[in-house]
């Protein structure tokens, strides 16, 4: 069987194809090469002479049980190497000869037993190494890190290593690799030597499930003493053993580690004092918790000095009461319980993110709402029913406005955005908007980007409520139910690019109201039930369009519409998936496509 | 169709086929099996995926004696530091996992419960398996 | 078994030619495809061109693209690599090779070329 060509000449899959030896039919140029779940068992020495171009090869679960020396030997372009669940038993010195340019290699589950035998030593180029799901014993890193000065990324997680000493880490001494990552989760640590990560740098240290209780992890965080971390991550996993007990005790050796981003991920555990739990985290510049259930919402509004706090997937008994002076982005995402709104004081936030909490809102939006004049970037999408009640007063710096899926009352009502003259980007998509008042976007001057699909229009009517959006590049007017449109609508976005008016329910086109739309690219009818023109003469869009798309409508293929049908085949250069265009009536021609239709029209004598 | 026999309970008796045409071997046990009335119990999976289960989330499509309830979908991996450990399982690797599930008070009418699980990972989105569930409901009370 | 034998190299000043010259023998019909690599002095082997017997497809590295062309004569089982406007980065021993239905590589004995003024 052959393997499908996904790119030609570039890209093919021959996943599982029962192959016993490399295939030797693809072309020379093959860049991407998955091979996976095939029984090659052994790869000899330049098993892939035929591949000069190779970039990416992924030999997951191919029975490989012996690698020999130089089998990847002239694959000087191969960046990736993926080997995960082979079996391997025998690996020679040179297994991994020639592989100048690999930037990440793959060992997930390959029985690989110590890092010291591993030959990779003279992998330069390597960006991330994950030996994850081995059984690998001991945390030292051998001499040969020194070699791997680019190396980004180590996941040693799922391994059996229980100590860390001082002597582990003494190559990451001789060489700082300022920007490595490293994944220890899922290793069942009893004991880490005092000093073992004094003066080290990590760009990040994730310790997840490492600890069968509270003492350990007590112990084992002392010991992390002298580390200067960017970012640490500790927690557990839903589905592995959790810790019976926590306490403030478990984090007290965090002060004596230098962290600047701190995350808690999901802990099997009520948190109800805060402010002691993570006292030794008041001063990281940002603090997150996923997946954590909360009781006491109070303690949000203590000082602490955190720049940007993120809470996601979490359960609060009520909207957390939040206070603190010097924060400037907050991520409150996808929780349960406090299903209303309360106001927040936080005079620094420039960034809001409250989408997916099922939110009330009973008035939005002004600066006491939050607390801020700072703010540029607000998103409320998907959350319940929010109440128009000002127009932004105090929040004039917004540039970002994201309210969709989530219920609109009183937008139609006055000019909700008025004040909003630095707003770059607005949804309102599935909001519930009607609109029935000519002003809805009045004072978006600065415009550019408006997402407006599914709602509805008075009458399905479009009139011309877009007169000041004279920098928009982008609309979307899609599924609003529209049957007409004001012959002016368009008149003042001579910038627009894109204008979406697919899924709704126009029985005609023309081309009279996109006359002003001079940088207009792309025009997309797609989903309507356009028929015929409005006019019998259709005149040229702007020249400017490069895209349009007409497809699933319900065109009639008559002799009464021969003129639109011919116009239609003289945009041929402009249309989109043109075999999608079928003609809906009369129904000897239903399921025809449009353009190869040859109407010769005829007087009936 | 070959049905995969999961489990007998005190009111539920529980199946499953294939609905995708790989049909890639996954065991599922649940112990003990579940009660609709009230359950408590283990979830064990045993599976190797034929892609990264990074972004994993289910489309769930459920019918009660014949009658069609709205798809859900369930996110189950977000993609960084998520809840559960398999969520970082590559393409190839052993996923052999254990999770824990508990519900009570629901009442469920007698008859047969239909709930094709639409597996979805990756970048860019492929379907991972499809497993059709039957679960026959005798409740001895109701 | 297949046995390569090179033939061709030498000494050669910039700007200059050489033909390079590969016969094979013994197993010859279950040669897939063939090909010319190439190892500088404290370098790793590299390809320099690739010919497959089946269709005819041909490949060449970036570095020697436009200057070096292989072709074969199938009368005389053999692989040839012209090689015109030569550099002196082109200095190396020249191997030849062949790849069989078996994935088993031959190699020959290599035959070295310098390009120098």
């Known amino acids: 069987e052959p393997c499908v060509e996904v790119v030609p000449n570039i890209t093919y899959q021959c996943m599982e194809l029962n192959f016993y030896k490399i295939p030797d039919n693809l072309p020379f140029s093959t860049k991407n090469l998955d091979l996976s779940f095939n029984p090659l068992r052994h790869l000899g020495s330049y098993s892939f002479f035929s591949f000069p171009e190779l970039q990416v090869l992924d030999l997951s679960r191919c029975e490989i049980q012996t690698i020999e020396d130089g089998a990847y030997q002239s694959l000087s372009h191969l960046s990736t190497l993926i080997l995960t669940g082979n079996p391997i038993q025998s690996l020679a010195l040179g297994a991994f000869s020639g592989l100048s340019s690999l930037q990440k290699l793959v060992a997930v589950e390959t029985n690989l037993a110590s890092l010291e035998n591993f030959p990779i030593g003279h992998l330069k180029t390597l960006k991330e190494l994950n030996v994850a799901h081995n059984l690998i014993q001991s945390f030292k890193l051998p001499e040969y890190f020194s070699n791997l000065t680019n190396l980004e990324h180590l996941d040693l997680s799922s391994n059996k290593i229980q100590s860390i000493y001082c002597t582990d880490l003494r190559v990451l001494h001789q060489m700082p690799l300022l920007n490595l990552s490293l994944d220890l989760s899922l290793n069942p640590m009893n004991f880490i030597q005092p000093g073992a990560f004094k003066e080290i740098r990590l760009h990040k240290l994730t310790l997840r499930n490492n600890f069968d209780s509270l003492n350990v992890m007590k112990t084992c965080i002392q010991g992390l003493a002298g580390l200067e971390v960017h970012r640490l991550v500790l927690g557990e996993f839903r589905n592995e053993g959790n810790l019976e007990k926590f306490d403030k005790s478990a984090l007290e050796g965090l002060c004596n580690l230098t962290i600047e981003e701190f995350r808690l991920a999901y802990l099997d555990y009520y948190l109800d004092d805060i402010i002691d739990l993570f006292n030794c985290l008041t001063n990281v510049s940002s603090f997150s918790l996923v997946s954590v259930t909360i009781e006491r919402v109070k303690d949000f509004s203590y000082n602490f000095g955190w720049q940007h706090l993120e809470l996601v997937n979490c359960k609060f008994g009520q909207f957390p009461t939040l206070k603190l002076k010097s924060l400037k982005r907050l991520t409150f995402t996808s929780n349960k319980g406090g299903n209303a709104f309360s106001e927040v004081d936080l005079p620094s936030l420039e960034f809001l993110d409250l989408s997916r909490n099922g939110l009330s809102f009973k008035g939005c939006c002004s600066q006491s709402d939050f607390g801020t004049t700072s703010l540029k970037y607000l998103d409320l999408s998907f959350n319940g029913v929010i109440t128009m009640s000002s127009n932004f007063l105090g929040l004039e710096q917004l540039e970002h406005l994201d309210f969709q899926h989530s219920n609109l009352k009183q937008m139609s009502e006055f000019s909700v955005f008025l004040s909003l003259r630095n707003l770059i980007y607005l949804d309102i998509s599935h909001t519930h908007t009607r609109v029935a008042f000519n002003g809805i976007f009045n004072g978006l001057s600065s415009l550019e980007v408006l997402k407006m699909a599914g709602n509805s229009f008075q009458e399905n009517f479009l009139p011309d409520i877009f007169t000041e959006l004279r920098n928009l590049t982008f609309l979307d007017l899609s599924q609003c139910q529209l049957e007409q449109l004001s012959p002016t609508a368009f008149n003042s976005l001579s910038s627009l690019q894109v204008l979406n008016m697919s899924h709704n329910n126009f029985f005609s086109l023309d081309t009279f109201p996109y006359k002003c739309l001079n940088s207009l690219q792309v025009l997309d009818y797609s989903l309507n039930h356009i028929m015929t023109s409005k006019k019998q003469e259709l005149q040229h869009f702007p020249s400017s369009l490069a895209f349009l798309n007409l497809t699933q409508n319900d065109f009639a293929c008559t002799c009464e519409h021969q003129s639109f049908l011919q116009w239609i085949k003289d945009q041929r250069q402009l249309l989109v998936e043109v075999e999608r265009m079928e003609c809906a009536t009369p129904s000897d021609k239903q399921g025809m496509p449009v353009l190869s239709l040859n109407i010769t029209c005829q007087m009936n004598k | 169709q070959k049905q995969y026999w999961v489990c007998n309970s005190s009111d539920a008796s529980i199946s499953y086929t294939y609905c995708d045409k790989m049909q890639y071997p996954i065991s599922i046990n649940v112990n003990p099996c579940i009660e609709l009335k009230r359950s408590k119990g283990l979830l064990h999976i045993f599976y190797i995926p034929r892609r990264d289960l990074k972004q994993l989330y289910f489309n769930l499509y459920i019918t009660v004696n014949t009658m069609n309830l709205p798809k859900r979908k369930e996110v189950i991996c977000r993609g960084s530091d998520d809840d559960y450990s398999f969520c970082r399982a590559l393409k190839g690797e052993t996923v052999n996992t254990t999770i824990s599930f508990s519900f009570k008070g629901i009442k469920f009418s007698k008859g047969k419960y239909k709930c094709v699980v639409e597996a979805i990972s990756g970048s860019p989105e492929e379907m991972l398996f499809c497993l059709e569930f039957v679960i026959l409901h005798q409740p001895n009370s109701n | 078994e297949v046995q390569l034998v090179e033939s061709g190299g030498g000494l050669v000043q910039p700007g200059g030619s050489l033909r390079l010259s590969c016969a094979a023998s013994g197993s010859i019909f279950s040669i897939n495809d063939m090909g010319w690599f190439r190892q500088a002095p404290g370098k790793e082997r590299e390809h320099a061109a690739l010919?497959?017997?089946?269709?005819?497809?041909?490949y060449y590295a970036d570095s020697v693209k436009g200057r070096f062309t292989i072709s074969r004569d199938n009368a005389k089982n053999t692989v040839y690599l012209q090689m015109n406007s030569l550099k002196p980065e082109d200095t190396a021993v020249y191997y030849c090779?062949?790849?069989?239905?078996?994935?088993?590589?031959?190699w020959g004995q290599g035959t070295q070329v310098t390009v120098s003024s």
């Open positions: 090779a062949a790849k069989t239905g078996t994935s088993f590589v031959y």
């Open positions: 010919i497959r017997f089946k269709d005819g497809s041909i």
